[in-house]
């Protein structure tokens, strides 16, 4: 009975320990579940942050490219090459230069080419009005980029396009044939045909640089 | 003895259960420690990501401001008002306009003022060379911004500054007195004095807009 009592006491102890351990395990299990939950939350947070970081990186890359482009454009524009070079007249889409020397038509054409331009081309009555006004204080003739081989050929501009008949009437040596061809000049607002070999002033024309305007 | 055996058996079971539970607790403890470690790592990772995200946001903000500034500058520069208005000639620091109508000196002065300009002022031989060349194909006179009340007064530019004597010699009506004063015009490269009441072409001049050049 003494043994039995001792065993009973030990059993009670063991049961108590077991219950205690089971309680501990239950608590640990709950804590573990909570920890798992927390860990999942942390992982989710990490995923969100990583995604956000990735998005930010993409946006930043885009902004960086935009920046580079803007800087490039700014460099180009800040040079803001004026619409026309010095000494030229800017009018609408074109730049005009009134030559200060007298040369034959071919030489005048070469002079314009050396300036990355062509001899005057009149495309419209507005162009004609501007030129007439610009040379209103001169009594001299100015070669323009209009010529023809002989009276049986059409009047052509330097770019090969034909003269629009409504623009102006050509006076002077219209019926003449010259070995050097017949060229057109403008004087006091009227257009005349003459031997291309003659020396005259001239008007060069080129497209205005209007990118940055 | 039967009770004793039963108690011993129960005791053995309980001890086994206790040991098992202790093992479980030990395993759980290790797992918990590992989980804690992992959680700490995750937290650290979150901290790092959060810091990185914050940095990126700052950089992005900076880039965004840079972008806005660049766009602002671009807007300002892209207006890049050309050095000179249309129909004017840009030469060095100035813009020049050759009038297309004939007016007396005072009226010519008013015309220039209405264009935010003044009548031609020649400051140097380089200026003179340019003007002489620019009017080389005209035989007409052009008023400039030089005048005097009568022969006992000095020649003055519109801004009140005196004419530098070495620049050019004034020919013509230099000794004449006119009620409207004596004004200077340039023709075929030479400068002449004449009654300001006469009508002539004129040359307007203003500073070129070279900010963005």
């Amino acid at each position: 009975s003494q043994v039995s009592n001792l065993l009973k006491q030990q059993q009670t102890n063991l049961t108590h320990q077991k219950n205690k351990l089971e309680g501990q395990i239950s608590a640990r299990q709950q804590a573990e579940e909570a920890s798992q939950e927390s860990q999942n939350e942390l992982k989710e947070m990490i995923e969100t942050l990583a995604w956000k970081l990735n998005e930010k990186s993409k946006e930043q890359m885009e902004l960086h490219h935009q920046n580079l482009n803007l800087q490039e454009t700014l460099k180009r524009v800040a040079n803001c090459s004026a619409p026309c070079p010095q000494d030229w007249i800017w009018h609408e889409e074109n730049c005009y230069l009134f030559s200060t020397g007298s040369f034959n038509w071919e030489k005048s054409q070469e002079k314009c080419l050396s300036l990355d331009a062509k001899l005057l081309k009149i495309n419209s009555t507005a162009d004609l009005d501007f030129i007439q006004q610009a040379i209103s204080y001169s009594s001299f003739p100015f070669w323009m980029g209009l010529s023809r081989r002989n009276p049986s050929y059409p009047w052509l501009w330097e770019d090969g396009s034909p003269l629009m008949p409504h623009l102006f009437r050509i006076r002077g040596a219209v019926s003449q044939t010259y070995p050097s061809g017949t060229c057109a000049y403008i004087q006091r607002g009227a257009v005349y045909a003459e031997n291309c070999i003659l020396a005259a002033f001239s008007i060069c024309q080129k497209k205005a640089n209007l990118r940055a305007q | 003895s039967q009770v004793s055996n039963l108690l011993k058996q129960q005791q053995t079971n309980l001890t086994h259960q206790k040991n098992k539970l202790e093992g479980q607790i030990s395993a759980r403890q290790q797992a918990e420690e590992a989980s804690q470690e992992s959680q700490n790592e995750l937290k650290e990772m979150i901290e790092t990501l959060a810091w990185k995200l914050n940095e990126k946001s700052k950089e992005q903000m900076e880039l965004h401001h840079q972008n806005l500034n660049l766009q602002e500058t671009l807007k300002r520069v892209a207006n890049c008002s050309a050095p000179c208005p249309q129909d004017w000639i840009w030469h060095e620091e100035n813009c020049y306009l050759f009038s297309t109508g004939s007016f007396n000196w005072e009226k010519s002065q008013e015309k220039c003022l209405s264009l935010d300009a003044k009548l031609l002022k020649i400051n140097s031989t380089a200026d003179l060379d340019f003007i002489q060349q620019a009017i080389s194909y005209s035989s007409f006179p052009f008023w400039m911004g030089l005048s005097r009340r009568n022969p006992s007064y000095p020649w003055l530019w519109e801004d009140g500054s005196p004419l530098m004597p070495h620049l050019f010699r004034i020919r013509g009506a230099v000794s004449q007195t006119y009620p409207s004063g004596t004004c200077a015009y340039i023709q075929r490269g030479a400068v002449y004095a004449e009654n300001c009441i006469l009508a002539a072409f004129s040359i307007c001049q203003k500073k070129a807009n070279l900010r963005a050049q």
Partner: antibody
């Protein structure tokens, strides 16, 4: 029909001046270049000057450059030659001639006017 | 200062063919057209040939012109008494920018 009629010739002392005119009719005056050509007694033709349709081109012989001035008035269909500082060697019959091109041929001529420079 | 050179005189019998030469340089005949004029005694000159070989209306086809290099020539076939006159060649000199005439050739129709 085309007509060119010179006038203004006469006797003038050396150093003197004279203005010749050439009245045109029978054609569109402003469509032609006009020349002055002279011929000294018993000599050949000597070109003097030419003016283009609206007066933009004017050319002169070296012998008259600086002394003679060619001009035209298209509203009056008239060509002029202002002759200053005249010399004995300027004595000649002065013809006006029209030209369909400044550098081309003279397809019509006037009958001429005699200028005599003598003291 | 005559720039174009012509023989002072040529002659031929009626019905014959005569030629009058006109010599210049690259700046005139060499690069421009040549014209020929006939001047009968006491009258104004009259255009005979233009653009080297073109005859204005009213000019008989007995008159013809040609050009080669820096020289030109006027040929008259079937010579007639009324052809007796002075003949002048003319061109444009682009270097001196002026009209140049030949000194003239006196054509005498013999017999």
């Amino acid at each position: 029909q085309v007509q060119l009629l010179e006038s203004g010739g006469g006797l003038v002392q050396p150093g003197g001046s004279l203005r010749l005119s050439c009245a045109a009719s029978g054609f569109t005056f402003s469509d032609y270049a006009l020349h002055w050509v002279r011929q000294a007694p018993g000599k050949g033709l000597e070109w003097v000057s030419v003016i283009s349709y609206a007066g933009g081109f004017k050319f002169y012989a070296d012998s008259v450059k600086g002394r003679f001035t060619i001009s035209r008035d298209n509203s009056k269909n008239t060509l002029y030659l202002q002759m200053n500082s005249l010399r004995a060697e300027d004595t000649a019959v002065y013809y006006c001639a029209r030209s369909p091109g400044l550098t081309s041929y003279h397809d019509s001529w006037g009958q001429g006017t005699l200028v005599t420079v003598s003291s | 200062d005559i720039v174009l050179t012509q023989p002072p005189s040529v002659s031929g019998a009626p019905g014959q063919r005569v030629t009058i030469s006109c010599s210049g340089s690259s700046s005139n005949i060499g690069s421009n057209y040549v014209s020929w004029y006939q001047q009968l005694p006491g009258t104004a000159p009259k255009l005979l040939i233009h653009s080297n070989s073109h005859r204005p209306s009213g000019v008989p086809d007995r008159f013809s012109g040609s050009k080669s290099g820096t020289s030109a020539s006027l040929a008259i076939t079937g010579l007639q008494a009324e052809d007796e006159a002075d003949y002048y060649c003319q061109s444009w000199d682009y270097e001196s920018e002026r009209v140049v005439f030949g000194g003239g050739t006196k054509l005498t129709v013999l017999g």
